[in-house]
Each structure stands twice: as C-alpha cells, then as structure tokens.
C-alpha cells in the first residue's frame, strides 16, 4: 500500500519499486542474457533517478527511463538492465535503486535458489506386493538423505491427492557414519485406495532447504503381466558338501514391483536369508529379478524341498506364483 | 525483428510477445505467488486478444490489457497472469497467446532449471578384467552426471599419482531426457601399470561447480578368490517354444571386478545380448552376480551348447572360469 508523505508543505505519493526478470524458455533454459525490468509505479509525478547495483556496487547511474505514463494523479515508468547469464548464475544480487524527492526506494533480486537443492534427496517407495495383497498392511516410506545436522528439525508431512485425511506420522532421524542425517517416515495405506489410483505426497521442509522437497507416488501405469518363476540348485561340490546355493529366476512381469520369498517346510524364511537383485528390463517386454539363497545340509536333510515364491499384482488367482526345487533330486 | 505484412491491401506490423516474471528476493526465495507479465509490443494499432495457457490448457481467455501506449506508429500493451508458487515449482509451462489480425503469436515460459543441479556427481570406473587380461586394452572411465547445460564447457583432466604423463583425452557430452548433461572421458591405461598399483585421478571443473570434483582410482586391495560358475536353462514352455532363457550364477569371487561373457559355437555373443546384475555380497565372503541370456530355437538347433564365461583376476591359469549348458539335454 502506498503512503502519502507531507514534505515542505507538499503532499506526494512515493513510488513502488518492483523488479521483473526475463523468463526462461519452455525447456527451463536461461537466456544468454538476462533482462531485469524495474517497474516504478504509483508515484506523484516528479523527477526520479534510477541506479542499478550489482552486489552493492554501482553498475549504471542515471539509468534512462521512458517518459512516465500517467494513470489519474499517479505516474509510472520503468528501467531496464541487461546482464550476462554467467553473472546471474553466479548468484550475484541486483538492486534497482530509485531516488525520488530526496529519498531512496529499492528492490533487490538474484537468481532463484535451486528448487531441488543439491545433495539433499527425498525418495518415496511404493508398497511391496506382499504387503499390499498378502499381509494386507501396505506402507509407503518417505526417505530423506544427506541432510546436514542442525538445531532445527526436519518436518515431513503426508497428504493425499483426493484430499482425504492422513494420520500424523512422526519421522525418525538417524545420524549416518558420514555425519549426515537420514530421516524416515512410514505411512500406512489402505490396499483399496492404492489399487484405485490414489496419489500420496510426502512434503519435506527444513529451514536450510530453499524450498520444500515434494515427492508423489501412485501405482504404476502401463500394461500388466504375471511373472514366470524358475528355480535351480547348484550341484554338489567337494569342498563345500554341507552348503548349496539355490537360484531363482523370476521374469517377464510387469510392472516391476515384486516381492520374493523362500519357503522351507511350509515356513517362510526370513528375508535376510536371501538376496534379490534390482528389477531389470528383459530384452522383450517385462522385468526380471534373481534371488539367491544359501542352504545348509541340516536344512535339506530335514526336508529336501525349497520353494521360491513371487508375489505380484498380475499373478492370478492369489497374487502368487511359486516353484519348488530339491537339492538332491532322486536321492 | 518485426516484419511488415500486407493483408487485403493493408500493411501492418505484428506484435512481439515476451513474458517477464516476478523475481526472487535477495535470498533467492520464490514469492508466494508468481506474476507473469506478457509484453506485447511494436504492433500496428489494432484489436488484440490475449489468452493464457497452463501446460497447453486455457486458463484465462480475453485477458484484460490496459489501453495501448503508442510510440510513433506502433502500439504496445501488456497482460498479467498470477499463479500459485506451487504450480510454478511443479514445472508447469505457461503461454501467453496473442491473437492479432487473425494470427496467433505467443511466448512460453516455465521455472528455470536448477543451475547447480542436485547431485552433480563424478564416478570413476576400474578397467574390466576382460580388458585388463584378455584383450589387453584396459581403460578407465570418468563419468559426470546431472550437470546443467550451459555455454561453458566442462573440463575433465587426468593425472597419475606417480607423476608420469597422461595423454590429453577429449570429453564427450550427452544431453539426457531430463535436460541434464552427462560428460564422459575414457583414459587408456597400461595393464602392468594398473597391476602394479598406479593411482589415476580425474578432476572435473566447471564455472557452475562451487569447487572441483576429484575422483581417484587404483586396484582393489584385499584377499583374492576365484569365481565358481553355474549355468542353467529354463524348461520348455508351451507359449514360447522357440525361446528359452539361460541363467548363469557366478559366485564367491573377490574382489568384485568381473567380466561376464556368453559363447555359442565358439563365438562370443555381443554384450548387449545378455544382462548382468551388479556384484553383491554373499552371506559368507565374496561376491556374486547373475547373468541372463535369451536364446532362440534357431541358435540351439545350430548348436545346442552355450557357455557362460567369467573373467576374473583370481581365476587361474588364464583368468577364465566357464561352464556350458544345453537347452535340450539328452535330445
């Protein structure tokens, strides 16, 4: 709001000073030169003087302005300043300084801070097919890594695109060996909501971040295909007769979200027992993973059958495809 | 440059359309709302109509413009559009579309790409065992990812800890779909130098990087263990009789550097034919990888034996361990 000042028995309205800048193209690229346009508006007609500063140093004195235009009682004009892209990108601050009736009015600007700051990353994981379809307790995890420790706490908030309510979930912080902080928040979701295409958003704010980091997650689009499961046992080796390796190839599934489990004597083995590769594309259509499990003689002597099970949304009727293998077939 | 058009015997000069945007403050923070100002200048006076689009969708039709100002023969006006910060930060594209004398003129803009993109990273790879021991033409690769495109070039320089000279290697730049640049430099090394423990350094400098990125690489220390190789074929499936998948498990090797190849009829198949997982730790000591190869009926009918070969520094006598598999054993 403009105030009206009384000076030496003359009333006047001082200018509002606002810098606009040339915009990036529709690929988000900076132009080779940056134009700054200083809009000087809403002042009682009178002499003005414009000076442009770079990091507080005078760059352009008595910068020319076009004849002022008038709207009612008040005048407006503008001043332009052009600078090289490299100076703008090096985070220099530019000030448009307007002198009017013996007083200085100004506005300052610099390149907008990177909206996705380097180093700090946020990730949002989809629920596992096992949690979605079998245990019916799906969760999604928001993970923030590489934060510098500070007095201020990180704030993670969840929301849903549908606007439906989301419970408040406390985040857990963990200091890493390299001195950075990792922050995690786990949100329970409802299987039906996920299947119906709800979008979940995790928003991360912290005083040291130039702006919030926002990550969204919804179910994968695209065609669906059930996995094929094949399981193999390595042959006996002289030097390690009491240990064998089982390999499970799970392939041609779409989308890439899959849960892999091993069962022995009708009991699911702990996930830590086996190692699963990241889903990778097949040469045709779909993804594949391998899982590797080391088993002991004590286990196969108790029961010589191990099952590799894949849980996937396209597997029917019960989201499960599995295959059994014997370590010593025919014995 | 404005052109002059002749339409039904009337000459006119069409408008230049340029979007300016409200600037960030001197801390680089985005304002809560973003003002876009569409400058429509240098046209022969006449009716104009302004429409604002967001991601190609009409947002504001017949957007009001103040009375045109005239400079000589030509007129200028402007149109304003205000949007929420969150829409600007979500990388939507905004277009000012000006209709004049039955023709459309426009300018589009979006948030500028991050100039110091998150996670500018440099990686230095070790030479592959195949290149080191078999083809005897080892190289190491320095890879820089997630750079923002700019006029200035990235500078990658190589050096050796021994101080011995290093050839000048030109770097290659590739623009990625997400708008970032990937820069690669490949340095040939001498097998003997590598084996004897020479350290190689890649130094990356660029005006937009706050400081140089430096990466060093030397051969892995620690114990050595040769790989075990096991290879399996998936059984025939009714729906895909003319295609089978071969799986190769290579395990218990140390260090993790390994090359995997497939051979058929004594010929090495192109690397692009198969997919190898990243080395992962076994539960005991050592690493494992899987390789997956799809083979066709035409291939196995020509010769029904495929070989999976691992090249590793601990494999003796010739750095190679391999295993054969038949698709149709006993047929």
């Amino acid at each position: 709001v403009n105030k009206t000042f009384g000076v030496s028995s003359r009333n006047f309205t001082p200018p509002t000073v606002k810098i606009l800048q040339s915009s990036c193209d529709d690929d988000g690229h900076f132009p080779p030169t940056i134009q700054l346009l200083c809009l000087i508006s809403g002042y009682t007609p009178g002499a003005i003087n414009v000076t442009w500063l770079e990091n507080g140093q005078v760059m352009k004195v008595n910068s020319p302005t076009p004849p002022a235009t008038q709207e009612g009682e008040l005048a407006s004009t503008q001043s332009e300043f052009t600078l090289a892209q490299k100076h703008w990108l090096s985070d220099r601050t530019y000030t448009c300084q307007v002198t009017y009736q013996g007083t200085t009015y100004n506005d300052s600007t610099k390149k907008c801070a990177d909206s996705n700051p380097r180093g700090v990353s946020a990730y949002l994981s989809r629920p596992s097919p096992f949690d979605l379809f079998i245990s019916k307790s799906p969760t999604i995890t928001c993970l923030v890594v590489d934060l510098a420790p500070s007095k201020e706490t990180v704030n993670l908030t969840w929301s849903r695109a549908s606007g439906k309510p989301v419970p408040h979930i406390p985040a857990t912080e963990k200091k890493q060996r390299n001195g950075t902080l990792t922050v995690t928040s786990i949100l329970p979701v409802v299987t039906q909501d996920w299947i119906e295409g709800e979008t979940y958003q995790c928003r991360v704010t912290h005083p040291h971040l130039p702006r919030a980091l926002v990550r969204s997650m919804t179910k994968t689009s695209g065609p669906r295909a059930a996995p094929e499961v094949y399981v193999f046992a390595t042959p006996e080796k002289l030097e390690s007769r009491d240990k064998r390796t089982l390999a499970c190839l799970i392939q041609n599934f779409m989308p890439e979200d899959i849960s892999v489990q091993w069962l022995h004597s009708d009991v699911q083995l702990p996930d830590a027992r086996h190692s699963v590769t990241q889903p990778r594309k097949t040469k045709g259509s779909g993804f594949f993973v391998f899982s590797r499990l080391e088993v002991t003689k004590a286990e196969w002597e108790q029961k010589d059958e191990f099952i590799c099970r894949a849980v996937h949304e396209a597997a029917s009727p019960s989201w499960i495809v599995q295959q059994a293998v014997s370590v010593n077939p025919g014995k | 440059v404005n052109k002059t058009f002749g339409v039904s015997s009337r000459n006119f000069t069409p408008p230049t359309v340029k979007i300016l945007q409200s600037s960030c403050d001197d801390d680089g923070h985005f304002p809560p709302t973003i003002q876009l100002l569409c400058l429509i200048s240098g046209y022969t006076p006449g009716a104009i109509n302004v429409t604002w689009l967001e991601n190609g969708q009409v947002m504001k039709v017949n957007s009001p413009t103040p009375p045109a100002t005239q400079e000589g023969e030509l007129a200028s006006t402007q149109s304003e559009f205000t949007l929420a910060q969150k829409h600007w930060l979500s990388d939507r594209t905004y277009t000012c579309q000006v209709t004049y004398q039955g023709t459309t003129y426009n300018d589009s803009t979006k948030k500028c790409a991050d100039s110091n993109p998150r996670g500018v990273s440099a990686y230095l790879s070790r030479p592959s065992p195949f290149d080191l021991f078999i083809s005897k033409s080892p190289t190491i690769t320095c890879l820089v990812v997630d750079l923002a495109p700019s006029k200035e070039t990235v500078n990658l320089t190589w050096s050796r800890a021994s101080g011995k000279p290093v050839p000048h290697i030109p770097a290659t730049e590739k623009k990625q779909r997400n708008g970032t640049l990937t820069v690669t430099s490949i340095l040939p090394v001498v097998t003997q130098d590598w084996i004897e423990g020479e350290t190689y350094q890649c130094r990356v400098t660029h005006p937009h990087l706050p400081r140089a990125l430096v990466r060093s690489m030397t051969k892995t220390s620690g114990p050595r263990a040769a790989p075990e190789v096991y290879v399996f074929a998936t059984p025939e499936k009714l729906e895909s009789r003319d295609k089978r998948t071969l799986a190769c498990l290579i395990q218990n090797f140390m260090p993790e550097d390994i090359s995997v190849q497939w051979l058929h009829s004594d010929v090495q198949l192109p690397d692009a034919r198969h997919s190898v997982t990243q080395p992962r730790k076994t539960k005991g000591s050592g690493f494992f990888v899987f390789s997956r190869l799809e083979v066709t009926k035409a291939e196995w009918e020509q010769k029904d034996e495929f070989i999976c070969r691992a090249v590793h520094e601990a494999a003796s006598p010739s750095w190679i361990v391999q295993q054969a598999v038949s698709v149709n054993p006993g047929k």
């Epitope: 695209g222 594309k281 259509s285 993804f287 | 990388d91 779909r177």
Partner: nanobody
Framework: EVQLVESGGGLVQPGGSLRLSCVAS????????MSWVRQAPGKRPEWVSA????????YYADSVKGRFTISRDNAKNTLYLQMNSLKPEDTAVYYC???????????????YGQGTQVTVSS
C-alpha cells in the same frame, strides 16, 4: 516428471476407424522415440508401432501393418495412432510409451500413459 496422456479410444464396429492421441509433457518430446503398446484382456502386452524422434522412421507389428499409421507432431508434443480397418482382435487397452534408451521395438518401457480402451465389436 514424464507424463503421457492418451485419448481417442472408444467403441467402434469392425472395419471402422479410430485415431488415438498421446500428449506428452515433462521432457523434450522431439528428442525421443515413441511407441504404442496394447494389452488385450487376459493376454500379455503386445508392441504395436514405433516412430523415431524426428518422425522420419516408423515401425509396425505384422498384425497391424497396412492398417495402422503412427505419426507425431513435435510442435504439439503429441503422438498419434490412426487405426483403420479395425478387427475384433484389435480390442485392447492402448498405451503410449517411451524409454530413456530404446523405444523403436518390443521392449519394456520406462514410461507409459494410463491407457485408452479400444473396443471393436458389432
């Protein structure tokens, strides 16, 4: 963020025509190859057609050759599939797809749209 939005599907009689569109955003559309993939109920996905980044090279599955035409308008960030002489076996959900690397043939793509249903029935 890469986004692909298909439209133009619907119910059509055998022998009829449809034109599918796919509007892309979030990437430099004109720099990337694009494909159409379809999935019939209870079947595995099937690659239909592809076009290179500039639009000069097109590729088709044998099942649609001579009936379907793929095209693109890079100025509008839009991919098209003109489907003529439609048959009941063309009934499927049609997806527009693209990939960071290879998108000119059967593949598992990095990005798909939500799909548009095409039903060919009398």
């Amino acid at each position: 963020e890469v986004q692909l939005v298909e439209s133009g599907g619907g119910l059509v009689q055998p022998g009829g025509s449809l034109r599918l569109s796919c509007v892309a955003s979030g990437f430099t559309f004109g720099s990337y190859d694009m494909s159409w993939v379809r999935q019939a109920p209870g079947k595995r996905p099937e690659w239909v057609s592809a076009i290179n980044s500039g639009g000069g090279s097109t590729y088709y599955a044998d099942s649609v050759k001579g009936r379907f035409t793929i095209s693109r308008d890079n100025a509008k960030n839009t991919l098209y599939l003109q489907m003529n002489s439609l048959k009941p076996e063309d009934t499927a959900v049609y997806y527009c797809a693209t990939d960071e690397d290879y998108a000119l043939g059967p593949n598992e793509y990095d990005y798909y749209g939500q799909g548009t249903q095409v039903t060919v029935s009398s």
